[in-house]
Interface confidence: low
């Protein structure tokens, strides 16, 4: 029998250029008579143009919704009712070709053509894009608050904030023809629920979304987004009602930046430079294509690419890469944003060099990508360390911490977290190395103690990049480095000349002069430690709630012992900057560290002094007794302590702690406490210091109170942020 043909709605969006009309400001106001009259004429022209082609039989509806410069650009959408089987045949490209063909056929025609009665349409200026009913609905919902802005070359235009009576607004942005638009979004409130979406076209087409941001992001307080060309749309959706705009938007046209480079690398190891997407740290644009050609001086070397919070992964099947596509020596890889460092190592087999291509495969983009490049020795990629194949990084081997996700850095170790004697491969405790007492059979633990040695897991690296064998040589009163750098920056870690923590005892004034109390409106929230004249270190999770993210809320007290009273030795500071570790992850507690810059430098006294920071190679031996301090609760669920409490805890081997916490303990964590429980940190101690005393009498910061199951529970140790795991970031910020 006869079966009715199934018809489907196909939606198209687009723009066309009119050569015999000029744009005027009146056309930006939808309520103006100029807009109404121009819309009516343009709508008529659009319908006549479509119905003049073989698309006419499918014509359903159309709308011209906006105008722009160029001399006059009309922005429109239309719907065709198409038989289901023809759906794929009438792609936007085909529809555009049909309409252009129609326009070209009448360019020199003297015959009366309805759609040319008023308008001279430029065939080259016609653009047709795929859209959906949902896109049109989204567009229509913004038309009550629709702003068109043209921004000229060299201009930076600050956009007028949204109309708070509307629930959604759209800024339609246009710039000069051969430039690209760069939009800057700055969140100005600590908390909001507003949503902003940026599109690479004039309207909210889901398939051309560049990015969407939501709710006053602390991770990205400023976002810069690049369009692929001179047109862009920004859609705002209201969050909570507010009389203050929670953001500032500004836009400027910028020139296309070439993203191609030829480089020849020097004959040396380590980082030699940086490659980045155009206008880094701006988001890369939807049609970014970068091609970097690097020539390596010799086949002894491989090329290393060091990424920050971005990794490359093999993409199975031919799915598009959603966070950037890379091709390196004909291998296709997909970028992936991660909260970890990552390195891609490229073996070099020919002197022709290596070409690296980066492409944004879809319109959805993300933060600009930056990569440090350099060489590594192909025969020994990680001298003295272990090459972690999972992430391409060099990690310490056999130090008792599984730095590599697959744990291979701790496999096949003859001596784990100990020194291996040359003579018979016996293992001795690290503090016994270079202590003047031979412990190995033939005294190999006391050899080469006065000279440079190859760098390894437990060697200390001097400023001149040479290494010394003696473990933990910092600030012990004896110069071990040729350049004396192990004895620099040693005005730290000494207690004052003075004579809560669960299971603790009250501290005296000046006993822990680095201890900080971080307060909000006069209430102690977290602990911290002074590490430099203007810097206090604490835990990132103290700022987890949006309401705690603003620097203006916080006051830092140093030299304090009692919460309910002041004494002459204590001082207070406001916070000028708050920096959370860029890899901090709330759920896993990984990289749980933050730095607070004080509004003025501290004046050192008996009661206020910094603690010493360990080198990356500093070894805090499991079993060592260290101390934690703070005003936290004296029992689980209890109120905070009035007096600064102190308690000794024992450092726990990583694998034991990892087992207890079901393998949630990362290499940036350190465990301390007792199998029996009792002595532990508790609520309110977060961010406070775990310090260990060196043989020199100086105290070194080993950890920060981070997390744990309850307080002082049997078998559940306290988990601390491992300072040696985040020291490079701390040094980078503080210096």
């Amino acid at each position: 029998g006869y079966k009715a043909e199934v018809m489907v709605s196909q939606v198209y969006s687009g723009s066309l250029r009119v050569l015999n009309r000029h744009f005027s400001q009146d056309l930006t106001r939808r309520e103006s008579s100029a807009f109404r009259s121009e819309t009516a004429k343009a709508q008529k022209m659009l319908k006549e143009l479509i119905t003049s082609t073989r698309l006419g039989t499918y014509y359903n509806s159309s709308s011209v919704y906006s105008f722009g410069e160029g001399p006059l650009t009309c922005f429109f959408w239309f719907i065709l009712q198409i038989p289901e089987h023809r759906r794929l045949m009438l792609s936007p490209e085909v529809v555009q070709a049909l309409l252009v063909e129609e326009l070209l056929s009448t360019v020199n025609s003297s015959a009366a053509v309805p759609y040319r009665a008023e308008y001279e349409v430029d065939p080259e200026g016609l653009v047709i894009l795929e859209a959906s009913v949902k896109d049109i609905a989204a567009l229509n919902s913004t038309l009550g608050c629709y702003r068109y802005s043209y921004v000229g070359q060299g201009q930076v235009l600050r956009l007028k904030g949204p109309d708070h009576l509307a629930s959604s607004c759209l800024w339609h942005l246009q710039g000069p023809k051969d430039l690209m638009l760069k939009l800057r979004l700055e969140w100005t409130l600590a908390e909001c629920r507003d949503r902003l979406a940026m599109y690479d076209v004039a309207g909210p087409l889901e398939k051309r979304l560049i990015t969407s941001v939501y709710g006053c992001s602390r991770q990205e307080p400023v976002v810069e987004v690049l369009a692929s060309g001179a047109i862009m749309a920004v859609v705002w959706k209201k969050g909570l009602h507010s009389y203050y705009d929670p953001f500032v938007l500004s836009v400027q046209p910028v020139v296309f930046q070439a993203c191609e480079v030829n480089l020849t690398l020097d004959n040396r190891l380590d980082s030699q430079g940086v490659l980045s997407t155009p206008y880094f740290p701006s988001y890369y644009s939807p049609q970014t294509h970068c091609s970097w050609h690097l020539t390596v001086p010799s086949l002894d070397y491989g090329l290393a690419l060091w990424f920050d919070a971005y990794a490359l992964r093999r993409q199975k099947y031919d799915l598009p890469c959603t966070q950037g596509q890379w091709t390196i020596q004909n291998r296709r890889l997909c970028g992936l944003r991660i909260l970890q460092p990552y390195a891609e190592r490229i073996p070099v087999v020919a002197t022709a060099g290596i070409t690296i291509n980066f492409t944004s495969q879809i319109s959805l983009t993300g933060p600009g990508v930056r990569v440090h490049y350099g060489l590594y020795n192909q025969s020994d990629p990680c001298p003295g360390e272990f090459l972690c194949s999972v992430n391409g990084l060099c990690v310490p081997a056999c130090d008792g911490v599984k730095d590599c996700p697959n744990g291979l850095d701790e496999r096949n170790c003859v001596c784990r977290a100990t020194f291996q004697c040359k003579e018979d491969s016996t293992c001795i405790s690290l503090p016994k190395v270079c202590d003047g007492q031979p412990d190995c059979l033939n005294g190999s633990d006391e050899e080469q103690c006065q000279e440079g040695v190859p760098c390894g897991t437990f060697t200390f690296q001097c400023e001149d990049r040479s290494c010394v064998k003696k473990p933990n040589p910092q600030c012990d009163g004896r110069p071990d480095c040729r350049d004396g750098s192990d004895e620099e920056h040693c005005d730290c870690g000494l207690q004052g000349p003075s004579s809560r923590i669960v299971g603790g005892a009250v501290s005296s004034e000046g006993e822990w002069p680095w201890q900080a109390s971080l307060q909000v409106r006069g209430r102690h929230i977290c602990g911290g430690a002074l590490i430099a004249d203007r810097w206090v270190i604490t835990a990132a999770h103290c700022f987890q709630e949006d309401s705690m993210a603003s620097t203006v809320l916080w006051t830092v007290f140093l030299g304090k012992v009692w919460q309910n009273s002041r004494w002459p030795g204590e001082v207070s500071f406001k916070v000028s900057r708050l920096l959370l570790h860029p890899y901090h992850e709330e759920d896993s507690h990984d990289y749980d560290v933050a730095l607070l810059q004080l509004d003025h430098p501290v004046v050192r006294s008996a009661a206020v002094r910094p603690v010493c920071l360990p080198a990356r190679s500093h070894f805090f031996e499991p079993g060592l007794h260290c101390w934690i301090t703070g005003w936290g609760a004296l029992r689980e669920g209890g109120p905070i302590s009035n007096a600064l409490q102190k308690v000794d805890v024992q450092l726990i081997p990583q694998d034991l702690c990892s087992e207890v916490y079901r393998y949630q303990v990362t290499p940036r964590m350190l465990c301390a406490g007792y199998r029996k429980g009792k002595k532990d940190a508790c609520q309110g101690d977060s961010g406070g210091p775990l310090v260990c005393k060196a043989l020199s009498g100086r105290w070194f910061l080993a950890g920060l109170v981070s997390w744990g199951l309850g307080c002082g529970r049997p078998n559940y140790f306290g988990v601390y942020t491992r300072i040696t795991g985040v020291i490079s970031w701390i040094q980078q910020v503080v210096t």
């Epitope: 009913v133 949902k134 609905a137 993409q315 199975k316 099947y317 799915l319 959603t322 759920d587």
Partner: antibody, heavy 118, light 107 residues
Framework: EVQLQQSGAELVKPGASVKLSCTAS????????IHWVKERTEQGLEWIGR????????TYAPQFQGKATIIPDTSSNTAYMQLSSLTSEDAAVYYC???????????WGQGTSVTVSS | DIVMTQSHKFMSTSVGDRVSITCKAS??????VAWYQQKPGQSPKILIY???TRHTGVPDRFTGSISGTTYILTISSVQAEDLALYYC?????????FGGGTKLEIK
Amino acid sequence: EVQLQQSGAELVKPGASVKLSCTASGFNIEDYYIHWVKERTEQGLEWIGRIDPEDGETTYAPQFQGKATIIPDTSSNTAYMQLSSLTSEDAAVYYCARSIYLDPMDYWGQGTSVTVSS
Amino acid sequence: DIVMTQSHKFMSTSVGDRVSITCKASQDVTTAVAWYQQKPGQSPKILIYWATTRHTGVPDRFTGSISGTTYILTISSVQAEDLALYYCQQHYSTPYTFGGGTKLEIK
């Protein structure tokens, strides 16, 4: 409180049709997708399809195309699923559930049991 | 269609044990995988979505992780009330598909 309340159990004859309802409270169905899922003993869960009540746009799993029809009634905050030409293979518990954007189904109805018997 | 394979129909465990339920996707679904718990006579309840994100109110003994195209639901210390049927589901592309389910039983 978010809830999806489904209609009661149905006993239907082979070849007949049945219309199941799913009424939402605590949220507006226009802001979500509404899905339907089939559960048969020993067969596990099968996704039937979903509707965007805002514009009526539906997506079905190929094996339910022509078998299931999902319709919204935004005025009563209810979604319906009609099953046609019922056979013993259609005897199952049917759940409605909601999701937002690309997220999976976060709240489910209590299920409606459909028995097909002559 | 994307096939989600839960290789174990049944898993025996004891209270206090750590248990991992796996689910393999026939193609890459990035992180778009959810885990549901279903107890007899009840509707499924969501535990994990986007492979690793715990749904509000779900106890933290439930964690989701990924290894290649294998998705893992781990219960760190099984409680009596965790005995149920567990399903994975990909929410990457329609038609959405579920795994065959894994029934957690007491030894």
